[in-house]
Amino acid sequence: MDSFNYTTPDYGHYDDKDTLDLNTPVDKTSNTLRVPDILALVIFAVVFLVGVLGNALVVWVTAFEAKRTINAIWFLNLAVADFLSCLALPILFTSIVQHHHWPFGGAACSILPSLILLNMYASILLLATISADRFLLVFKPIWCQNFRGAGLAWIACAVAWGLALLLTIPSFLYRVVREEYFPPKVLCGVDYSHDKRRERAVAIVRLVLGFLWPLLTLTICYTFILLRTWSRRATRSTKTLKVVVAVVASFFIFWLPYQVTGIMMSFLEPSSPTFLLLKKLDSLCVSFAYINCCINPIIYVVAGQGFQGRLRKSLPSLLRNVLTEESVVRESKSFTRSTVDTMAQKTQAV
């Protein structure tokens, strides 16, 4: 988040009256973690295991197909975004275990916590690209027959990644390490110092571009797609709707706490009770957003099982079936699973 993420252990007697109990050593420390931090650690551990293994499997499955299958290109890029974010988790985990002490230096402070934001922007932009692709397949099938190719898909992905990097720059630039005098601790966070307006601007841009605008556009986009598929009596449309709703919902559900607390903290005074309360929940909100990095493979597997009736195949072949089936470019009743369902397995979970 953009307010300095420095939740401390419970030095209750320092926080309120700044008094030290004279019967205890001056540099006494607390070994207990707050409940939100413990929950964050559990989530981080699960996300890391599922995210690294799951996304590695998705990358492995889609990488071989990416030259000829456009859907594979989309899922490959989404999996790479999620996989990269998961690599930061051991460091973030270690920091929380040490009561948010950051012994990893300034460069790591700038890069690693920014990966989740890069993931958010990359994912949402890739999903917008995928959604545009789905939309064109339904409403401009002739154009797709002529121009929809792997080269264009890779260009679209490159643009999405470039924009994502650009949008992550503000948080990257303002991220600093600060060494607190007492209790002795190095903290990693974002410091806008005198520039509260800039902090608010960054938070608003993040909320609009990373949440509200995608929510609006994707809702409209899939409403049109689903209305068209239903009007053509496409098969498996109920299944499609469920998967689309699940995937879209996952993105917005898991990013909502992060976005809400982020925008609130940018408008609050750092010394206000509400700000301090939100700051204590910061790690939990970040970990909740991180669930997006491992949810995709889960959705693919669940969707794959749904398509197969039951899990009859090996995991890689099931994933290959879900992720690499090419869309049929026909504006007919055969616009079914291959076009809508394949798109649906992962259209919004980042």
Partner: antibody
Framework: QVQLVQSGAEVKKPGASVKVSCKAS????????MHWVRQAPGQGLEWMGY????????KYAQKFQGRVTMTRDTSTSTVYMELSSLRSEDTAVYYC????????????????WGQGTTVTVSS | DVQMTQSPSSLSASVGDRVTITCRAS???????????LHWYQQKPGKAPKFLIY???NRFSGVPSRFSGSGSGTDFTLTISSLQPEDFATYYC?????????FGQGTKLEIK
């Protein structure tokens, strides 16, 4: 009452070392941290670091790292600050100061100060 | 390091005047516990500094009520509501949130 009494003025040559003492009385020595702050002629105050007399833990400002050493003798309630490789810019009044509150320990501010020790570095 | 910038660097005033000294930190000095460790010290020539105000606005024991502090985040002020002869001295702001602890360059308050 609380008192911090420092050693007398020193004149040193460049490259030499100086050791300034600060004897504490009137309070429980190990309950309060001891800091050293210096003031060059006509200049402002500059924090050098602190020592926790209870544990012996020290923390020095980056600027003085490698040149300053703070030690304590709990039996005499005395803290020492040694500055090595002296240069002319080290000419200053050196203060020891306690971080603590009135009736309680508080590491965030300096409530009692020594009278200061003038260290002159001149060839 | 956090730079503490005081203004003005010197100030002439008369007994009974209301005086305001400002101090600006180069970055936020709000501690992770929510407190702001910004303090004010008074120093007279040839003497050790004396502690006046802690945590922005709290007077230390024995400090007259004419001394008051305010501010938040990065901008702070020390106000002397009615100057007394004994108040003519140099005033320093200091932060003890971040290492290294740093002081302002001082504001010398002189008799007009």
């Amino acid at each position: 009452q609380v008192q911090l009494v420092q050693s007398g003025a020193e004149v040193k040559k460049p490259g030499a070392s100086v050791k300034v003492s600060c004897k504490a009385s009137g309070y429980t020595f190990t309950n309060y941290w001891m800091h050293w702050v210096r003031q060059a002629p006509g200049q402002g105050l500059e924090w050098m670091g602190y020592l926790n007399p209870s544990s012996g833990y020290t923390k020095y400002a980056q600027k003085f790292q490698g040149r300053v050493t703070m030690t304590r003798d709990t039996s005499t309630s005395t803290v020492y600050m040694e500055l090595s490789s002296l240069r002319s810019e080290d000419t200053a009044v050196y203060y020891c100061t306690r971080s603590g509150g009135d009736n309680y320990g508080n590491p965030y501010y300096f409530d009692r100060w020594g009278q200061g020790t003038t260290v002159t570095v001149s060839s | 390091d956090v730079q503490m910038t005081q203004s003005p660097s010197s100030l002439s005033a008369s007994v009974g005047d209301r005086v305001t000294i400002t101090c600006r930190a180069s970055q936020s000095i709000v501690h992770s516990n929510g407190n702001t460790y910004l303090h004010w010290y008074q120093q007279k020539p040839g003497k050790a500094p004396k502690f006046l105000i802690y945590k922005v606005s709290n007077r230390f024991s024995g400090v007259p009520s004419r001394f008051s502090g305010s501010g938040s985040g990065t901008d702070f002020t020390l106000t002397i509501s009615s100057l007394q002869p004994e108040d003519f001295a140099t005033y320093y702001c200091a932060q003890s949130t971040l290492v290294p602890l740093t002081f302002g360059q001082g504001t010398k308050l002189e008799i007009k």
